[in-house]
Interface confidence: medium
């Protein structure tokens, strides 16, 4: 009886849930996750399990520290649910659900030119666009690289256009574009093209 | 049946190099962590390091430096590097895999039979 | 690191009788310790984990107690294919390290 009385006052007052969470929560497959289950309670000695749906993945003993598991997220259904258990003698609380959320990674954009070419100016219009790759994806094109453009978000497989124009330029330019969605630390850049320094056959990309 | 095999034990002059392997079969390393434990003759139970199913490593202060776990979860088999080896280093090497899945706080459920590395000139 | 003492080194005994050896951990480890059993030639098979869980498959004569810093494997009634040696292990783990730590083994002999 005392037994049950000890876990029920745990369960209002020293024992809360415990806390699952991951410093990752977007993710590409493949890639490598820590899961961290952690508790209020710094001295108890805890026993945490972890669930993927109904699945148990593993156990660990911890005292202060959080458990940590250690996972590969390969698969749609690796995303989650998953549920941290800890349990102190015949206690036990769960944690509320935690998922990943599966993003493919953009692949290298392409960038395409189209150049109006006047007598004193040229107007310049930049297409980027990656073809694969979790949407949405953010373009930033980039000249001589600086930043030219805002993130421009795409929502759909279309390309991003920036527009500029210049002053018939004395030296060369070299244009390129970011392509970059919701995985973090991870960004693809178009190969670079070279804007020639004056207009006429040397301009490969101007209509006149 | 889980069976764990290490090989690539032998006899190595002082300040050479030598690469043991662990190969796994009956169950996927992904899934482990895996640790590397030695045994002087005659004396006690040394560990090593583990290493971890996403590939982190931790050593024993003593081994940090001249030795280097790794793995190839495709072969899967868990590999030690032993570099600049000392005549203190001759042991019957064991690869252990921990009880508990995705996580290097764990004890050992499963040896390998041991190979034994002489350094001696 | 933590360091693990077991004691005795060795000890003699007869079949039948009744063996404690301890373990002390230089710091409290909870109940995160494991016992393994050694036979000449052979690698370490694990009997008890947790401080106190029998593995599956091992007698019912092997238990272990014990919490923080002092442990305790008991051989309830000896038998002959007992005589062997036994390590003790911690396993401790952090956000920045994960390490072993065995103690330097008991060998139980024949009186």
């Known amino acids: 009886r005392k037994a049950v009385l000890d876990c029920e006052a745990m369960k209002t007052n020293e024992f809360p849930s415990p806390c699952l969470d991951s410093k990752t929560k977007v993710v590409m497959k493949g890639q490598n996750v820590s899961m961290f289950c952690s508790h209020k309670n710094k001295s108890l000695q805890i026993t945490y399990s972890l669930f993927r749906r109904k699945t148990h993945l593993g156990t660990q003993d911890g005292k202060g520290e959080p458990a940590i598991f250690n996972l590969s997220i390969t698969e749609a259904h690796e995303s989650g649910p998953y549920k941290c258990k800890a349990q102190v003698t015949s206690c036990s609380k769960y944690s509320r659900d935690f998922s990943f959320t599966i993003v493919d990674p953009v692949t290298s954009p392409v960038l395409n030119i189209m150049v109006i070419q006047t007598e004193t100016d040229r107007h310049i219009t930049l297409h980027c666009l990656s073809v694969n790759g979790s949407l949405p994806i953010n373009y930033t094109f980039f000249e001589n690289h600086v930043a030219i453009s805002p993130a421009i978000s795409k929502y759909d497989r279309e390309p991003a256009e920036f527009n500029l124009t210049k002053k018939n330029p004395g030296e060369e330019e070299e244009y390129r574009c970011e392509a970059k969605n919701r995985l973090p630390n991870y960004a693809t850049y178009s190969h670079p093209v070279t804007m020639p320094s004056t207009g006429g056959d040397s301009c490969p990309f101007c209509l006149k | 049946e889980v069976q764990l095999v290490e090989s690539g034990g032998g006899l190595v002059q002082p300040g050479g190099s030598l690469r043991l392997s662990c190969a796994a079969s009956?169950?996927?390393?992904?899934?482990?962590?895996m640790s590397w434990v030695r045994q002087a003759p005659g004396k006690c139970l040394e560990w090593i390091g583990t290493i971890s199913t996403i590939d982190t490593t931790y050593y024993a202060s003593w081994a940090k430096g001249r030795f280097t776990i790794s793995r190839d979860n495709s072969k899967n088999t868990v590999y030690l590097q032993m570099n600049s080896l000392r005549a203190e280093d001759t042991a019957v090497y064991y690869c252990?895999?921990?009880?508990?899945?995705?996580?290097?706080?764990?004890?050992?459920?499963?040896w390998g039979q041991g190979t034994l590395v002489t350094v001696s000139s | 690191d933590i360091q693990m003492t077991q004691s005795p080194s060795s000890l003699s005994a007869s079949v039948g009788d009744r063996v404690t050896i301890t373990c002390q951990a230089s710091e409290s480890i909870g109940s995160l310790l494991a016992w393994y059993q050694q036979k000449p030639g052979k690698a370490p098979k694990l009997l008890i984990y947790r401080a106190s869980t029998l593995e599956s498959g091992v007698p019912s004569r092997f238990s272990g107690s014990g919490s923080g810093t002092d442990f305790t494997l008991t051989i309830s009634s000896l038998q002959p294919e007992d005589f062997a040696t036994y390590y003790c292990q911690s396993y401790h783990y952090s956000s920045s390290s994960s390490y072993a730590a065995f103690g330097c083994g008991t060998k139980v002999t024949v009186l």
């Open positions: 009956g169950f996927s390393l992904s899934s482990h962590a």
């Open positions: 252990a895999r921990l009880s508990e899945l995705y996580t290097t706080n764990s004890y050992y459920s499963r």
